[in-house]
């Protein structure tokens, strides 16, 4: 693969990663596809410092991240281990709530208006953040 040494135009560099912040909304799967075609992935939050950086850029707006449990356990799209990794859920979340009336539960994670995380219906059209790492040969993102 080819190594990326600087961020693409319109992306923001932070701690050797590049971030792109959408201005519009998509369902989680469509947002995931958008990032993948850009050789990136939905943002994977690995530290409180990264959480604060993303939160600063998105503001108080529901925004998808690269975390889902559509196949059972919670998984980060880049393979980062969920169980041992950073988490910032709202109290009593995730709750896989079925009461929304849209069918099924809640399988995709997003930043809420205060930055903490919630699980929600993956079809909701939220904004999203793409991330790609610098100095790392690009490779095919893992399948969901």
């Amino acid at each position: 693969g080819s190594e990326r040494t600087c961020c693409p135009v319109n992306w923001v560099e932070h701690e050797r990663s590049c971030y792109w912040f959408s201005r519009s909304g998509k369902a989680w799967a469509d947002a995931d596809n958008y990032c993948r075609l850009e050789d990136a992935h939905l943002v994977v939050v690995t530290s409180w410092e990264e959480q604060k950086f993303v939160q600063h850029h998105i503001g108080p707006v529901n925004t998808w991240m690269g975390l889902h449990d559509q196949n059972g356990p919670w998984k980060w799209v880049d393979g980062t281990d969920y169980e041992t990794g950073f988490k910032n859920w709202r109290p009593e979340q995730p709750d896989d709530w079925y009461g929304h009336g849209l069918g099924g539960g809640e399988d995709c994670a997003h930043f809420t208006d205060d930055g903490r995380w919630n699980d929600d219906v993956c079809q909701r059209p939220y904004r999203w953040v793409c991330e790609t790492e610098l100095d790392k040969a690009s490779q095919e993102p893992p399948l969901l």
Epitope: G1, P8, R23, N33, R36, E38, D39, E140
Partner: antibody, heavy 120, light 107 residues
Framework: EVQLLESGGGLVQPGGSLRLSCAAS????????MNWVRQAPGKGLEWVSA????????YYADSVKGRFTISRDNSKNTLYLQMNSLRAEDTAVYYC?????????????WGQGTMVTVSS | DIQMTQSPSSLSASVGDRVTITCRAS??????LNWYQQKPGKAPKVLIF???SLKSGVPSRFSGSGSGTDFTLTISSLEPEDFATYFC?????????FGQGTRLEIK
């Protein structure tokens, strides 16, 4: 000068296969997603497929899904479209196209096109 | 998939006329809307990208506007070389669909 040059078109029978190539020059090929777009005689433009710069992500129009495969060789600056199980309705001029910057930008550079005719 | 509907499908006009072509997306497409010009036997050429940004080298008589689902291409004063076919395209979501085209003919 940024250039794209398609090749590999021709006459093929229904059910047959062809592989189109698109040779790129004048830009850092691996940094750009690439696309195939086709145009049937006297008709409009139809997007066929896209591939990310690394080749890790591929997308297809429903009309070609399962029959066509997009790929790239970044060491050769070449984009490919493997077309199998060809049908009469695949007859068209096939263009490769490069976006302005990001994968979701407009197609800034187009090749001259290569004609594919599917007929018995 | 996002369907793109262009109107009119054909248009007759004279040199110096102001011409407007519209494009409607079946789903929200933000400002990921591009306009192309194509002449017979040639590859398309991008005129407008991101709904309203003029591609460098394209004459300023071409302009684009709109956001969301409704978009417009305007040619303020037609020149002889503008008679061609025009296509809109959304690049918000794959498949990156095109409108069916507008053929601009000399009256």
């Amino acid at each position: 000068e940024v250039q794209l040059l398609e090749s590999g078109g021709g006459l093929v029978q229904p059910g047959g296969s062809l592989r189109l190539s698109c040779a790129a020059s004048g830009f850092t090929f691996s940094s750009y997603a690439m696309n195939w777009v086709r145009q049937a005689p006297g008709k409009g433009l139809e997007w066929v497929s896209a591939i990310s710069g690394s080749g890790g992500a591929t997308y297809y129009a429903d009309s070609v899904k399962g029959r066509f495969t997009i790929s790239r060789d970044n060491s050769k600056n070449t984009l490919y479209l493997q077309m199998n199980s060809l049908r009469a309705e695949d007859t068209a001029v096939y263009y490769c196209a490069k976006p302005l910057v990001g994968a979701h930008d407009a197609f800034e550079i187009w090749g001259q096109g290569t004609m594919v005719t599917v007929s018995s | 998939d996002i369907q793109m509907t262009q109107s009119p499908s054909s248009l007759s006009a004279s040199v110096g006329d102001r011409v407007t072509i519209t494009c409607r997306a079946s789903q929200y497409s933000s400002d990921y809307l591009n306009w192309y010009q194509q002449k017979p036997g040639k590859a398309p050429k991008v005129l407008i990208f991101a709904a309203s940004s003029l591609k460098s080298g394209v004459p300023s008589r071409f302009s684009g506007s709109g956001s969301g689902t409704d978009f417009t291409l305007t040619i303020s004063s037609l020149e002889p070389e503008d008679f061609a076919t025009y296509f809109c395209q959304q690049s918000y979501s794959t498949p990156f669909t095109f409108g069916q085209g507008t053929r601009l003919e000399i009256k």
